[in-house]
């Protein structure tokens, strides 16, 4: 499914992607009167540093070698932040003393940018993406994708790390954004809503699809994540909205199928290797493309987001096992892991097609 | 030294039964799958059986499947092929290999052990 | 007969270059899965010479090297030496059979 870009030919539901429209304070729910379940903010854990929280964990990137068994990675740390379905907050929780990011969580306090300042910049995402408001950009080609096919062995490593669901990702998979602009991924995760609740962190005039999946890379001029952290184009997230479609995804199936064994918070399982990109819309050419943030602590910038404009289809009870499977810190489900909506504050989203 | 070595091949009759070890050591076993792969006389490579790292998912190529199992016990960083109901066709060196390069390639092999099956 | 299709025998004069393919299909190679190639001397086991269509093991001279496009791969040897006479096998996964196939096998020959 595709997102419309005029407003005449369409009601949201099919595509997947938005425009360039920061979300005014109404989105933003306060503090108080922010729900635990609403939007909470968070994004992607970068892997790295232990004491580099992100987007959701980050795995550490090390050079090249013959016998890369598996690609350590270091859960960055976690922060939660109180939400609304659809209007998340920008809060965390710090369970430790001192500049830790690595508890936080959904909706609670302290706010976000005590957790990490960066959270409070001026670039930060998601954002409402408005098709109409979108600058066409012929420059922006279609991307590419390499080796993202992976065999079933070595598995991979499947983890609830108590703010999403994430799946590291081995040496080897390239991105290109086009010429120059190179990328290895790292880690895949998901945002979700709840039983009847969207839960996508982007949303496209304002329609909040019912989930998101991001996957996360780094700049192939730098070697670790926390170089990258905060410089423009060190990393890029690849975001595609999921919506409900009436057949069962057979590529997201593989990952689903495993959600029970991973419902604690913390715990991990092993998956067989599968297509990454098949987990991915299959038109790589149309997207829009804008320079933010991760959605977590530490909300760092210059982080280049590309949204896809087609969607991503599973089936209902596939969303279903998605929003209602996993737990968090507590007793908590972990339900509702988006981030608020962010202000553009002048910056305007580019569209690969007119 | 990071190396595999092999033990259990000789002759058996068709229909017979055979067990392969395969003792790992110089790397972490325990964290690699690792396949059996054989090469019949003057004949080319072909790919057996595999098993993750913690032996919960294995896989098998057709010509072997329901008469080959494939097991590992990670505590003696051994892996095993257990072959029932042999064939003259099963005749070949058997290979084994460590699973471990993301990409599917299998960078450490056993010297391999030579399992004829003849009446 | 393999999925895999390699040339049974290629061969070069010392100092030359030679190259070896493998050609696949849209359930292998042309579906993305790496190709990976393989070195068998005589007698000995295989060695692990080129993975991920292009990386060469440490250890592995740099007149080998690896290339893939659409659903065939190759290897190149530059400079070629008398210790280079072996078997190589080239080798991907194959999504349809579910299965890690070897080519058949090309003999290398130094005159």
């Known amino acids: 499914q595709r997102l419309p870009r005029m407003q005449e030919d369409s009601p949201l539901g099919g595509g997947s992607s938005g425009e360039d429209d920061p979300l005014g304070e109404e989105d933003l729910p306060s503090e108080e009167d922010s729900p635990r379940e609403e939007d909470p903010p968070g994004e992607e854990d970068l892997p790295g540093e232990e004491d580099l929280p992100g987007e959701e964990d980050l795995p550490e990137v090390k050079p090249k070698s013959e016998e890369e068994g598996s690609l350590k990675l270091e859960d960055l740390p976690t922060v939660e932040a109180p939400g609304d379905p659809q209007e998340p907050q920008n809060n965390a929780h710090r369970d430790k003393e001192g500049d830790d990011q690595s508890h936080w969580r959904y909706g609670g306090d302290p706010p976000w940018p005590r957790v990490s300042p960066a959270c409070a910049g001026r670039f930060q995402s998601p954002v409402d993406i408005r098709p109409q408001l979108a600058a066409f950009c012929p420059a922006l080609r279609p991307l590419e994708l390499l080796g993202f096919q992976l065999p079933p062995l070595p598995e991979l490593r499947l983890r609830n790390n108590g703010h999403s669901v994430q799946l590291t990702l081995p040496p080897g998979l390239e991105m290109a954004l086009g010429p120059g602009r190179e990328y290895r991924a790292l880690q895949l995760h998901l945002h979700w809503g709840a039983a009847g609740r969207p839960g996508s962190e982007h949303t496209v005039e304002g329609h909040r699809f019912p989930a998101e999946i991001h996957v996360v890379h780094l700049s192939t001029a730098f070697a670790r994540v926390d170089e990258a952290l905060g410089r423009p184009g060190g990393l890029a997230v690849l975001a595609a909205f999921l919506e409900e479609g009436p057949e069962e995804n057979s590529a997201y199936e593989q990952l689903l199928s495993r959600l029970e064994e991973i419902a604690e918070e913390g715990s991990e399982t092993q998956v067989p290797g599968l297509d990454i990109s098949a987990l991915l819309p299959s038109d790589f050419s149309r997207y829009f493309q804008y320079e933010g943030s991760l959605t977590t602590p530490p909300c760092a910038q210059g982080v280049i987001w590309t949204v896809f404009n087609q969607t991503v289809m599973l089936s209902a009870k596939q969303l279903h096992t998605l929003s209602d499977t996993l737990w968090g810190p507590g007793d908590s489900r972990l339900q509702l892991n988006f981030r608020a909506t962010q202000p553009l504050n002048g910056r305007v989203i580019e569209a690969s097609f007119p | 030294q990071v190396q595999l070595v092999q033990s259990g091949g000789g002759l058996v009759q068709p229909g017979g039964s055979l067990r392969l070890s395969c003792a790992a050591s110089?790397?972490?076993?325990?964290?690699?799958?690792m396949s059996w792969v054989r090469q019949a006389p003057g004949k080319g490579l072909e790919w057996v059986s595999a098993i993750s790292a913690n032996g919960g998912t294995t896989y098998y190529a057709d010509s072997v499947k329901g008469r080959f199992t494939i097991s590992r016990d990670n505590s003696k960083n051994t892996l095993y092929l257990q072959m029932n109901s042999l064939r003259a066709e099963d005749t070949a060196v058997y290979y084994c290999?460590?699973?471990?390069?993301?990409?599917?390639?299998?960078?450490?092999w056993g010297q391999g052990t030579m399992v004829t099956v003849s009446s | 007969q393999s999925v895999l299709t390699q040339p049974p025998s290629v061969s070069g004069a010392p100092g030359q270059r030679v190259t070896i393919s493998c050609t696949g299909s849209?359930?292998?190679?042309?579906?993305?899965?790496?190709v990976h190639w393989y070195q068998q001397l005589p007698g000995t086991a295989p060695k692990l010479l080129i993975y991920?269509?292009?990386n060469r093991p440490s250890g592995v001279p740099d007149r080998f090297s690896g290339s893939k496009s659409g659903t065939s791969a190759s290897l190149a040897i530059i400079g070629l030496q008398a210790d280079d006479e072996a078997d190589y096998y080239c080798?991907?996964?194959?999504?349809?059979?579910?299965?890690?196939?070897f080519g058949g096998g090309t003999k290398l020959t130094v005159l």
């Open positions: 080798q991907s996964y194959d999504s349809t059979l579910r299965v890690w196939m």
């Open positions: 110089g790397f972490p076993f325990s964290s690699y799958a």
């Open positions: 290999a460590n699973n471990g390069n993301y990409r599917g390639a299998f960078d450490i």
């Open positions: 991920g269509n292009t």
């Open positions: 849209s359930s292998n190679i042309g579906a993305g899965y790496d």
